[in-house]
């Protein structure tokens, strides 16, 4: 057993049928030693009396909050949350594994530059009696500080008959260099409790190898004349680490009909404008990528072709 | 220690395609380790991160772009002093800070070198004949401290008398490769920068 | 599969005109972009232009511009390439080759030779 | 116009043997770069697409690298089937441009 903030315990259980389970000592925080009695969760029946009530911890039945009373008067507060381990593997029922990039991905982050900010999120089917606690570091020995946010719903989906909610939450590096190279990974470390269920997870990455730019900004279009070309230029996004210079961008430039299945005219390069051929009822599409560390590509601005 | 705004013509900065060409070579050379070892822990997950040239070289501060000079965050303590002449300085206005920064790119490229080196001899004694290092690679090493062309002492080649650990020595080839990597980006980078300055 | 069939050698003598056939099949025709190339013998590849056969725009090669006309038939899935006062460096295998990218080619014919002699 | 320059012209390799073909480009293409097999007497055939990109049913020895200027396609282990000539292609802008071709042949 262990204390995951003031007052809130997490038993920890192996969970196989007819295990024995944990026992758990509560002790009345109180300097009253008589006269006390110990309740579970609304329930009046009593439990047990004295300053220290000893349970043993099997099922989510055993788990909630034990109250200590004197005298119709409460005393102090402690609740029990379980964390099960399963065939020697803690549970995940709480958060969807997303299963990108790979299986047992149920943290993703993302960072629009190398300013130390950035932005986890995670998916569940629970919408109710739902806490999320977010703490993270750079490195885990010798840890570094990053400071995160509240973690707040930030979508709504239906999934079939299910509904799906996203959780997010921001975290910024407290003392970050855009130009410093990586050797300690950030850790990021979720509590979840879902009514008496504890649960957590952990992500580790460098800041590079989560980079996702946000998409170029301000495309525009030139007709160039006796031609079927165009020229299509753009700017770097406001948010890309500065200067453009050292944090270079390489881009895709695309010109596709509605449907992914249609013909397209697509080209690479360095630059902010490129000529491409439009079509009719197609639009062009740009993205972008850190030039040097290949990290993941930006979502695509578009502007129609006519 | 940052790097001034008046620096090369645009164009003319001889590096440029030298950088350009390592952080390529390094990066086949990463992926080719990596599939070639794939039973080896060589991800950038598995491995441990290690930076041979930490204390020895400050690149990474020698080469700040001046406008990261204001962010606090940047700006290390260490000083490392560095020889001055070099054939990627073509412009006279070219200042000490730059010649700091490329020189510690040249010591970095010097001990990167000496390390593969030693590392490819072990290698090639292996009866398994596994992997060795991308003659390109090293080329390409050679090429850009050629075009750098700081004269500084010849570091010897690390020779061991003692029976070489085939495994030790992939793993160590993969953490090389990881850090070399990452070198070669702030390398580019920074020759990027140059460039347009 | 997708398949591009070409059209029989030709013999022509100089300044005379060449058209050279494309069938398509195994694919919605106006799918894909179709190009033609030519190599003369034991030379390399050149790239004389593309059709979009959805629309029959065009674009060639300006060395020849003004000389080489490229038209489809959509009703029989069929690429022509018209090539005018041919020289007899013309002489050449001409291949059609389509893709639905447009500037690389993934799908070629098996080429038709064209033998420009007087 | 964009030229593209192959080299060697000629490459003799033994079968098994690793072979290393270049493509260089008169200006930054990115990686707007394209590599075909030509067999005699037989279309060109696409092998790898944007410098690195495999196509489907290309055995794994063949890999391509490179951005900007310069360009590697390589075999790691030549097989009888793999001599043949090959072309490098541009696609950066029109007009398409290929490379003169480099002959692989026979040691």
């Known amino acids: 057993i262990w204390e995951l903030k003031k007052d809130v315990y997490v038993v920890e259980l192996d969970w196989y049928p007819d295990a024995p389970g944990e026992m758990v000592v509560l002790t009345c925080d109180t300097p009253e030693e008589d006269g006390i009695t110990w309740t579970l969760d609304q329930s009046s029946e009593v439990l047990g009396s004295g300053k220290t009530l000893t349970i043993q911890v099997k099922e989510f039945g055993d788990a909630g909050q034990y109250t200590c009373h004197k005298g119709g008067e409460v005393l102090s507060h402690s609740l029990l949350l379980l964390h099960k381990k399963e065939d020697g593997i803690w549970s995940t029922d709480i958060l969807k594994d997303q299963k990108e990039p790979k299986n047992k991905t149920f943290l993703r982050c993302e960072a629009k530059n190398y300013s130390g900010r950035f932005t986890c999120w995670w998916l569940t089917t629970i919408s109710t009696d739902l806490t999320f606690s977010v703490k993270s570091s750079r490195g885990s020995s010798d840890p570094q500080g990053v400071t995160c946010g509240a973690a707040t719903l930030s979508a709504e989906r239906v999934r079939g008959d299910n509904k799906e909610y996203e959780y997010s939450v921001e975290c910024q590096e407290d003392s970050a260099c855009p130009a410093a190279e990586e050797s300690l990974p950030i850790e990021v470390m979720v509590d979840a409790v879902h009514k008496l269920k504890y649960e957590n997870y952990t992500s580790s990455f460098f800041i590079r190898d989560i980079i996702k730019p946000d998409p170029p900004k301000n495309l525009q279009l030139k007709p160039l004349k006796n031609s079927r070309q165009v020229e299509v230029s753009w700017e770097y996004p406001d948010t890309w680490s500065t200067p453009h210079s050292y944090f270079s961008l390489t881009f895709c430039v695309q010109v596709q009909g509605k449907s992914k299945r249609e013909k397209k005219d697509r080209v690479f390069t360095d630059k902010t404008s490129a000529t491409v051929i439009c079509r009719k009822n197609a639009s062009i599409s740009v993205r972008a990528q850190d030039r040097y560390y290949s990290s993941s590509w930006s979502e695509w601005a578009s502007v129609p072709c006519s | 220690r940052n790097l001034p705004v008046a620096t090369p013509d645009p164009g003319m900065f001889p590096c440029l395609h030298h950088s350009q060409n390592l952080l390529r070579a390094v990066s086949n050379m990463l992926q080719k380790a990596r599939q070639t070892l794939e039973f080896y822990p060589c991800t950038s997950e598995e491995i441990d991160h290690e930076d041979i040239t930490k204390d020895k070289t400050s690149t990474v501060e020698a080469c700040l772009p001046l406008e990261l000079t204001k962010n606090e965050s940047c700006l290390n303590s260490r000083e490392t002093s560095f020889i001055t002449n070099g054939s990627c300085l073509a412009s006279r206005k070219t200042s000490f800070m730059m010649a700091l920064c490329l020189s510690s790119i040249y010591e970095d490229l010097k001990m990167y070198q000496v390390e593969f080196k030693t590392m490819n001899a072990k290698l090639l004694m292996d009866p398994k004949r596994q992997i060795f290092l991308d003659q390109n690679m090293l080329a390409v090493i050679d090429e850009l401290m050629q075009a750098l062309n700081f004269n500084s002492e010849t570091v010897p080649q690390k020779s061991s008398l003692e029976e070489p650990d085939f495994y030790k020595t992939k793993i160590k080839l993969c953490i090389l490769l990881h850090a070399f990597r990452i070198r070669a980006v702030t390398i580019d980078r920074v020759m990027s920068y140059l460039n347009a300055s | 599969q997708v398949q591009l069939v070409q059209s029989g050698a030709e013999v022509k003598k100089p300044g005379a005109s060449v058209k050279v056939s494309c069938k398509a099949s195994g694919y919605a025709f106006t799918d894909y972009y179709l190009h033609w190339v030519r190599q003369a013998p034991g030379q390399g590849l050149e790239w004389m232009g593309w059709?979009?056969?959805?629309?029959?725009?065009?674009e060639y090669a300006p060395k020849f511009q003004g000389r080489v006309t490229m038209t489809t038939d959509t009703s029989t899935s069929t690429a022509y390439m018209e090539l005018r006062s041919l020289r007899s460096d013309d002489t050449a295998v001409y291949y059609c080759?389509?893709?639905?990218?447009?500037?690389?080619?993934?799908?070629w014919g098996q080429g038709t030779m064209v033998t420009v002699s007087s | 116009e964009i030229v593209m320059t192959q080299s060697p012209a000629t490459l003799s390799v033994s079968p098994g043997e690793r072979a290393t073909l270049s493509c260089r480009a008169s200006q930054s293409i990115s990686i707007n770069l394209h590599w075909y097999q030509q067999k005699p007497g037989q279309a060109p055939r696409l092998l790898i697409y944007?410098?690195?990109q495999s196509i489907s049913g290309i055995p794994a020895r063949f890999s391509g690298s490179g951005s900007g200027t310069e360009f590697t396609l390589t075999i790691s282990s030549l097989q009888s089937e793999d001599f043949a000539v090959y072309y490098c292609q541009q696609s950066n802008s029109f007009p398409l441009t290929f490379g003169g071709g480099t002959k692989v042949e026979i040691k």
């Open positions: 944007f410098a690195s």
């Open positions: 059709i979009d056969p959805e629309n029959g725009d065009t």
């Open positions: 080759a389509a893709n639905k990218e447009l500037r690389y080619f993934d799908v």
